[in-house]
Interface confidence: low
Amino acid sequence: EPHSLRYNLTVLSWDGSVQSGFLAEVHLDGQPFLRYDRQKCRAKPQGQWAEDVLGNKTWDRETRDLTGNGKDLRMTLAHIKDQKEGLHSLQEIRVCEIHEDNSTRSSQHFYYDGELFLSQNLETEEWTVPQSSRAQTLAMNVRNFLKEDAMKTKTHYHAMHADCLQELRRYLESGVVLRRTVPPMVNVTRSEASEGNITVTCRASSFYPRNIILTWRQDGVSLSHDTQQWGDVLPDGNGTYQTWVATRICRGEEQRFTCYMEHSGNHSTHPVPSGKVLVLQSHW
């Protein structure tokens, strides 16, 4: 997977009046990395991992950048000539990527009330607008405003692309992102299902990177896909991920089943606990 930096900013308006402040989150390689704390008006690292990336430096630069981006987005929302009643949101997602072959990609996406209405490739400056008439109207409003704003010139878009990549490279230089491998903690639990059946659940948590294989095996052979239920692989807020897989088995056959986990070249198997012991928890 490519290395990526993703900015997610949202501003709100109430009856046409743009609210002060904004919401902002930054993801590094798909992990929550920074957020803007509205009460303290500061960019803050999301967990110890994020702090490690920049060492003991202050987050003044990130605070300044996010504040500037938030101000720009508030001005953009003020120029949207849409229905003014009620609560509305304008969201901007900006992503830049560095691929294994060192090629780069950058894009910017705008959402109004959660609906995508405008995208731009920041390298080619090509705009894309969905077909709906609402999206077309919104996109026209925003593009006209961006054209009017002297800052939103070709130079500005190239700068946005370059700045994002520069920040991404700066974070990657710490080495924390590149070398990090955190093995999962694996829990196996059982719960009563219908008569004669039990549901067994295998949970993997606190692992990085995101890629993991988690599956139930019977007598050493993986169960078919349709007999298992998988959870999404989700960030857990600590710079690591969590997921789970569950299946239903006959009571009394627990010893035939194991949870198989494979992560970053390592693998392990985890048995179903007996009825007396509810949870088996292990790091491999």
Epitope: N8, T10, L12, W14, D15, Q19, L23, A24, E25, P32, R35, D37, R38, Q46, E85, G86, L87, H88, S89, Q91, Y111, D113, G114, E115, G237
Partner: antibody, heavy 117, light 107 residues
Framework: QVQLVESGGDVVQPGRSLRLSCAAS????????IHWVRQAPGKGLEWVAV????????YYADSVKGRFIISRDNSKNTLYLQMNSLRAEDTAVYYC??????????WGQGTMVTVSS | AIQLTQSPSSLSASVGDRVTITCRAS??????LAWYQQKPGKVPKSLIY???SLESGVPSRFSGSGSGTDFTLTISSLQPEDFATYYC?????????FGQGTRLEIK
């Protein structure tokens, strides 16, 4: 101390009306949008209505639209909810809560409304 | 209206356990999500705002993450006072909506 205190809850028959009040203190009431949120016995939270800080605009959940009216008197630091054509399903604890528009970090203690024949 | 679906609906856990509750929105809501704790007969208490910001006075064992449609509330080490019902709430657009709640019980 920041506070919201609801009053006016009662037992009423279906089809009748009731007015709830919410008195605010400890913060600048006229700067905040205020919401009503309700919770039926043993059930989850349900947003009911919101009124803008200056009282100009009001928004309602579909379940109460056309029956309930939210209003405020900034000179008295008080929020109101006029509930008409009450139904059994309106039985709930009614909370006023503040969020401009935001997470509700100020809640009243709630007032119970029971609609029963 | 934006629908919020919490999972699980109920959960049994022990003191010291790490617990995760998820909230999924029917459409993207950016970071406009809050989490509340409610104990029986008590008023809801705000824990997290803007998806991941800890409300003042809330213990650091509570954390929130996610943006867009998928959100999580994590309690890193359960304490006896944490057994309660937890709700997520979106304030991205009207009508404001809440998840159906997750009841956290002592195992």
């Amino acid at each position: 101390q920041v506070q919201l205190v609801e009053s006016g809850g009662d037992v009423v028959q279906p089809g009748r009306s009731l007015r709830l009040s919410c008195a605010a203190s400890g913060f600048t009431f006229s700067n905040y949008n205020i919401h009503w949120v309700r919770q039926a016995p043993g059930k989850g939270l349900e947003w009911v209505a919101v009124i803008r800080y200056d009282g100009i605009n009001k928004y309602y959940a579909d379940s109460v639209k056309g029956r309930f009216i939210i209003s405020r008197d900034n000179s008295k630091n008080t929020l109101y909810l006029q509930m008409n054509s009450l139904r059994a399903e309106d039985t709930a604890v009614y909370y006023c809560a503040s969020g401009p528009p935001d997470a509700f970090n100020i809640w009243g203690q709630g007032t119970m409304v029971t609609v029963s024949s | 209206a934006i629908q919020l679906t919490q999972s699980p609906s109920s959960l049994s856990a022990s003191v010291g356990d790490r617990v995760t509750i998820t909230c999924r929105a029917s459409q993207g809501i950016s970071s406009a999500l809050a989490w509340y704790q409610q104990k029986p007969g008590k008023v809801p208490k705000s824990l997290i705002y803007d998806a991941s910001s800890l409300e003042s006075g809330v213990p650091s064992r509570f954390s929130g993450s996610g943006s867009g449609t998928d959100f999580t509330l994590t309690i890193s080490s359960l304490q006896p006072e944490d057994f309660a019902t937890y709700y997520c709430q979106q304030f991205n657009s009207y009508p404001i909506t809440f998840g159906q709640g997750t009841r956290l019980e002592i195992k």
